[in-house]
């Protein structure tokens, strides 16, 4: 689809005569009829196959034609067509005299023709005007012409339709040849595909508008090249989406089990040494002068009850001092001036004379001790509970309250982290200082053998006679595809030789 444009520039008819030679009265009031048609070697009358147009009266005798509307007409004259431009044409331009106001052909006498010119040739589509001048014995016509495409039509023949757009269906302008030229940031045949942010990961990222980088599920970051750990993960990272690879000191499927309680919580007080002993479990080794599970209690020199025979202990800067009751003396009130006659044995103890009555010895009932049976037996003084267990006096006996991760009468046994059978899919559990470790069977991996990995059952080349080996992923076994002439699960038997 396009337009043939004809620009009339100047018409000269100095003598003001008709084609017949007869003069116009009072002068030749001139208008033009234009006929555009297909190419003819010899231009003949007939239908104006490409279109026709008439002008109003443009002047009298000789005149120049302005480049605009003139008396209701247009200059250049427009001859639109809605087909592919063939590249060739025939053009007939007739100058007529209008005696009156009616310019219709049937209203004019045949001898009102002033002049007629006919040209034919090739004409390519383009913006440039072709200038031409046609002269007869009495007249001269100067004009120019061209063929241009209609809006949204492009190409050598105005046959390519292209309408610029910037919407969901495309983002482009049109080149002179009708090809699409994508707007910045868009690509693809119809410029519908945005160009993502430079560096945006090809598989993990996408975009819905230029310079964007949106991540597919499981990926994060500016370029979608960082994975997102598992939803439940606490202290772990990933190398592929939804993994949970634990930081040092953390364990468990979601890295939520503290294997390094000492570092993370610093439970031991007063400069004590902390030792990890399993999940959320630790032991504090106290510095001299401190006690308690977390070494939080300061020991007094008197805490060991050094004064005997009911002596009272007083703390001093450089140690302690015993205040002895009547009848006793010595650093720890260990010497007695008493005899059995003074009833020195407390709590039902029985007195035995010694050294001919110069001294005595007390025999104490159960649960009491001391040279005068003055002290209740503390079965916890020997600190019998191991691994930070708490000793409790229970009448004539004692018991140990163990810290998590330990058991036994004296908390001497470490509770196996493997007791819970934490290794999935038949994995073997090993107790280590730092926690547990699973040795996984073939086909499984992960900290707890929870991840299924496909086994390459073909790795051992089980198929004979150049058979093709495949792994059956449902059973992790191999399948041999035998070449012609062989049978058997491993293609080991030639056809015709049954297995022996």
């Amino acid at each position: 689809s396009g337009v043939f444009q004809l620009q009339l520039q100047e018409f000269v008819n100095e003598r003001g005569v008709l084609a017949s030679g007869r003069p116009c009265e009072p002068g030749c009031r001139t208008f033009f009829r234009v006929c555009l048609k297909h190419f003819q070697a010899v231009v003949s009358p007939g239908p104006c196959t490409f279109g026709s147009v008439s002008t109003p009266v443009l002047g009298t005798n000789s005149f120049a034609v302005r480049d605009d509307s003139s008396g209701g007409g247009r200059n250049p004259l427009q001859l639109p067509f809605n087909f592919t431009w063939p590249g060739t044409f025939s053009l007939i331009i007739e100058a007529w005299h209008a005696p009156g106001d009616d310019l219709r052909p049937e209203a004019l006498p045949p001898d009102a023709l002033i002049s007629k010119i006919a040209i034919q040739g090739s004409l390519a589509v383009g913006q440039n005007w072709l200038l031409d001048e046609q002269t007869s014995t009495l007249t001269r016509l100067r004009y120019s012409y061209r063929v241009i495409c209609s809006d949204n039509y492009y190409g050598d023949n105005c046959s390519r339709l292209c309408k610029k757009r910037n919407d969901h269906f495309g983002h482009y302008v049109c080149q002179p040849d009708g090809n699409l030229s994508c707007l910045p940031g868009w690509t693809g045949e119809y410029c519908q595909q945005p160009i993502c942010l430079s560096g945006c990961h090809e598989q993990n990222g996408y975009c819905s508008k230029p310079a964007e980088c949106l991540c597919r599920p499981g990926w994060q970051g500016r370029l979608c090249n960082e994975c997102i750990p598992h939803n439940g993960c606490r202290h772990g990272t990933c190398s592929t989406p939804w993994q949970c690879t634990c930081d040092e000191g953390w364990g468990g499927l979601f890295c939520d089990q503290d294997l390094n309680y000492c570092t993370h919580h610093s439970p031991c007080k007063n400069g004590a040494t902390c030792s990890n002993s399993g999940q959320r479990s630790y032991t504090c080794t106290c510095r001299p002068g401190y006690t308690g599970v977390d070494c939080e209690l300061e020991l007094s020199e008197c805490d060991s009850n050094p004064c005997r025979n009911g002596g009272s202990c007083k703390d001093q800067e450089d140690g302690y001092h015993c205040l002895c009751p009547p009848g006793y003396y010595g650093l720890h009130c260990e010497h007695s001036t008493l005899s059995c006659a003074d009833s020195p044995c407390f709590n039902g103890g029985s007195c035995r004379e010694r050294n001919q009555g110069a001294s005595y010895a007390c025999e104490c009932p159960p649960n009491f001790t001391g040279s005068n049976c003055e002290k209740k037996v503390d079965r916890c003084t020997s600190n019998p509970c191991a691994n930070g267990g708490q000793c409790l006096n229970r009448g004539p006996s004692r018991m140990c309250r163990c810290r998590p991760g330990f058991t036994g009468t004296y908390c001497e046994r470490h509770v196996s982290d493997c007791a819970r059978n934490p290794c999935a899919h038949g994995g073997t559990c090993h107790d280590l200082e730092s926690g547990l470790m699973c040795t996984c069977p073939a086909g499984f991996s992960g900290r707890r053998c929870e991840v299924r990995t496909s086994i390459d059952a073909c790795a051992s080349s089980p198929c004979f006679n150049r058979a093709t080996c495949y792994t059956d992923l449902s059973t992790d076994t191999f399948v041999c595809n035998c070449p012609y002439g062989f049978v058997g699960s491993r293609c080991e038997f030639p056809v015709g030789l049954p297995p022996s």
């Epitope: 599920p217 500016r222 997102i228 606490r234 930081d247």
Partner: antibody, heavy 118, light 107 residues
């Protein structure tokens, strides 16, 4: 235990600003993308913004783009939402959540109410 | 944006009942769908992700299923603590979008 605690909500006039904070604990904060999700009174949930773990790349819903800024301080285990040019339609309970725009929101804070009214 | 439509908007049921809530996406979201439970005055809690995977600590009476555009949350035997509002969410396409919610009330 994973804990997310929001603060900074309150009453603000249209056109005003507010900065919300979210203190995170119980997980290694720097590894995880974080988001803000809001809920207008009596209405449903609406994603507002997300920020990736280590590189801090931010994404926003169209209606808050250019007005809200999500940021994080991995050293302080903290997430922030700077809200400028507030409008009445921004009135909502704002939740801090662990998750990204392309993943489930696994953990949520208790929420902080933002009221935009003259 | 992807539209998520939950049905019903509300429903009444009794303790012990089996309840089903449906979520429909305006286009294929594959299996990238989560379900949340929210009680009045509380924050939402993740129940199910990837259409059918139970979140840590969620009772086994909750289950999820679906494919393509339609997904379902099922509570096999309602307990008193299950009365709440339930939301679905897709996270295949940007931006993530939630359903309008289904309020589960005691009959």
């Amino acid at each position: 235990e994973v804990q997310l605690v929001e603060s900074g909500g309150g009453l603000v006039q249209p056109g005003g600003s507010l900065r919300l904070s979210c203190a995170a604990s119980g997980f290694t904060f720097r590894y995880f993308p974080m988001s803000w999700v809001r809920q207008a009174p009596g209405k449903g949930l609406e994603w507002v913004a997300s920020i990736s773990g280590s590189d801090g790349w931010a994404s926003y819903r169209d209606s808050v783009k250019g007005r809200f800024t999500i940021s994080r301080d991995n050293a302080k285990n903290s997430l922030y939402l700077q809200m400028n040019s507030l409008r009445a339609e921004d009135t909502a309970v704002y939740y801090c959540a662990r998750g990204y725009y392309n993943s489930p929101f696994a953990y949520w804070g208790q929420g902080t109410l933002v009221t935009v009214s003259s | 944006d992807i539209q998520m439509t939950q049905s019903p908007s509300s429903l009444s049921a009794s303790v012990g009942d089996r309840v089903t809530i449906t979520c429909r996406a305006s286009q294929e979201i594959y299996r990238n769908l989560a379900w949340y439970q929210q009680k009045p005055g509380k924050s939402p809690k993740l129940l199910i992700f990837d259409t059918s995977v139970l979140a840590d600590g969620v009772p086994s009476r909750f289950s999820g299923s679906g494919s393509g555009t339609d997904s379902t949350l099922t509570i096999s035997s309602l307990q008193p603590e299950d009365f709440a509002t339930y939301y679905c969410q897709q996270y295949t396409y940007y931006p993530p979008t939630f359903g309008q919610g289904t309020k589960l009330e005691i009959k």
